[in-house]
């Protein structure tokens, strides 16, 4: 049994890091493999992650971590029984994939203005809380070409757009994702989408 593709990990910079790897053949990850991880710090204890299958030869493990900060570095050991298959390290702050924003809501009752709001996925004491920027994707269910991205580069988790910038009388969907420049993160997954019917009063022709 050998590792074909070494583990690569990403952290949500809060409580979970996800590691994925591939074996050289079909593997029952949860019964045959264990991923041990330990913070390089005083008093830290070794933890064991039981991987799940991710395709025939692929495995994925969700590592639980407390109080993740930029100074943290973890040792990783992948075991098959008594055999050490791979040894490496992982610094969560250098491989961040933020959590997806939540609670995306479209407020349509604001005088021909659409107000989209969502929730920051981090608590205020997390460093990423004040460093997320967002991308909002709005698209028409009827017209695949009517697809737009709004970049929200301020901290407020909201976006205002004129309803008239979208077509009236049809349904739209929106979703939002986040990233943080400070840690050069990847984009988060998209939030669940929300749907609304766009209608506004056309201005009177003169």
């Amino acid at each position: 049994m050998k590792v074909l593709q070494e583990p690569t990990c990403v952290s949500d910079y809060m409580s979970i890091s996800t590691c994925e790897w591939k074996m050289n053949g079909p593997t029952n990850c949860s019964t045959e493999l264990r991923l041990l991880y330990q913070l390089v710090f005083l008093l830290s204890e070794a933890h064991t992650c039981i991987p799940e299958n991710n395709g025939g030869a692929g495995c994925v493990c969700h590592l639980l971590m407390d109080d993740v900060v930029s100074a943290d570095n973890y040792t990783l050991d992948l075991w098959a029984g008594q055999q050490l298959l791979w040894k490496g390290s992982f610094k969560p702050s250098e491989h961040v994939k933020p959590r997806a924003p939540g609670n995306l809501t479209v407020h349509t009752n604001v005088s021909d203005t659409l107000l989209l709001t969502w929730s920051n996925p981090y608590p205020p004491d997390n460093y990423l809380y004040n460093h997320l920027t967002y991308a909002v994707n709005i698209w028409s269910e009827n017209d695949p070409a009517d697809f737009r991205i709004y970049n929200v580069t301020y901290l407020e988790p909201s976006l205002r757009i004129a309803a008239s910038t979208l077509k009236s009388g049809i349904s739209y969907r929106a979703r939002v994702r986040a990233w943080a420049q400070c840690y050069n993160t990847t984009w988060s997954e998209w939030s669940p989408s929300t749907k609304w019917h766009n209608s506004y009063r056309e201005p009177f022709e003169q």
């Epitope: 005083l42 008093l43 109080d67 900060v69 930029s70 100074a71």
Partner: antibody, heavy 116, light 111 residues
Framework: QVQLVQSGAEVKKPGASVKVSCKAS????????MHWARQAPGQGLEWMGI????????SYAQKFQGRVTMTRDTSTSTVYMELSSLRSEDTAVYYC?????????WGKGTLVTVSS | QSVLTQPPSVSAAPGQKVTISCSGG????????VSWYQQLPGTAPKLLIY???KRPSGIPDRFSGSKSGTSATLAITGLQTGDEADYYC????????????FGTGTKLTVL
């Protein structure tokens, strides 16, 4: 919000022991390390040791080895620091502080006076 | 005896800028992360800067930190009378067993 509430001031005689408590609230107690530091009157900060509330393991500054004991009670989210064989030089304000590589939150401090 | 050396005192007038240095070695500042703590008179220390240059929420951007080699610097701009306090740098010794270190402390006087 995070709070670290320490026990009140103590006056002890040389050779005695003192046990200072630090009750934590506003966060997951077992998820954060707790440090103890002290500050003698008019002096700087001095690190004493650290406890991992999750398993109760400890590490102490060499200067205090054999004289200090740090414990925790997860049922009350409280950590304790006991210092024995007290001498006059141990007169100081003792602080608990939450954190790992840096100390996010500090208790208000407990003044321990050692005097005959 | 701390191995992190700070000037005993610094002073400046309101509105001015002041810097506080923290000098260490390759086994501490040179190989670890620096934090800074503010201790107002009669109170407990408060985290001001961590991870060399990051501010906890609620700390104004008048406070900034930097690190170069084996020394670190805390800068305070737009000095206010309320900034008068003792300031301590902190880091970790990584030579044998890891343990935290505090600097000798600097008394800031706002003239």
């Amino acid at each position: 919000q995070v709070q670290l509430v320490q026990s009140g001031a103590e006056v002890k005689k040389p050779g005695a022991s003192v046990k200072v408590s630090c009750k934590a609230s506003g966060y997951a107690f077992t998820s954060y390390y707790m440090h103890w530091a002290r500050q003698a009157p008019g002096q700087g900060l001095e690190w004493m040791g650290i406890i991992n509330p999750s398993g109760g393991s400890t590490s102490y500054a060499q200067k205090f080895q054999g004289r200090v004991t740090m414990t925790r009670d997860t049922s009350t989210s409280t950590v304790y620091m006991e210092l024995s064989s007290l001498r006059s030089e141990d007169t100081a304000v003792y602080y608990c502080a939450r954190g790992k590589w840096w100390l996010y939150n500090w208790g208000k401090g407990t003044l321990v006076t050692v005097s005959s | 005896q701390s191995v992190l050396t700070q000037p005993p005192s610094v002073s400046a007038a309101p509105g001015q800028k002041v810097t506080i240095s923290c000098s260490g070695g390759s086994s501490n500042i040179g190989n670890s992360y620096v934090s800074w703590y503010q201790q107002l008179p009669g109170t407990a220390p408060k985290l001001l800067i961590y991870d060399n240059n990051k501010r906890p929420s609620g700390i104004p951007d008048r406070f900034s930190g930097s690190k170069s080699g084996t020394s670190a610097t805390l800068a305070i701009t737009g000095l206010q009378t309320g900034d008068e306090a003792d300031y301590y740098c902190g880091t970790w010794d990584t030579s044998t067993t890891m343990y935290p270190l505090f600097g000798t402390g600097t008394k800031l006087t706002v003239l």
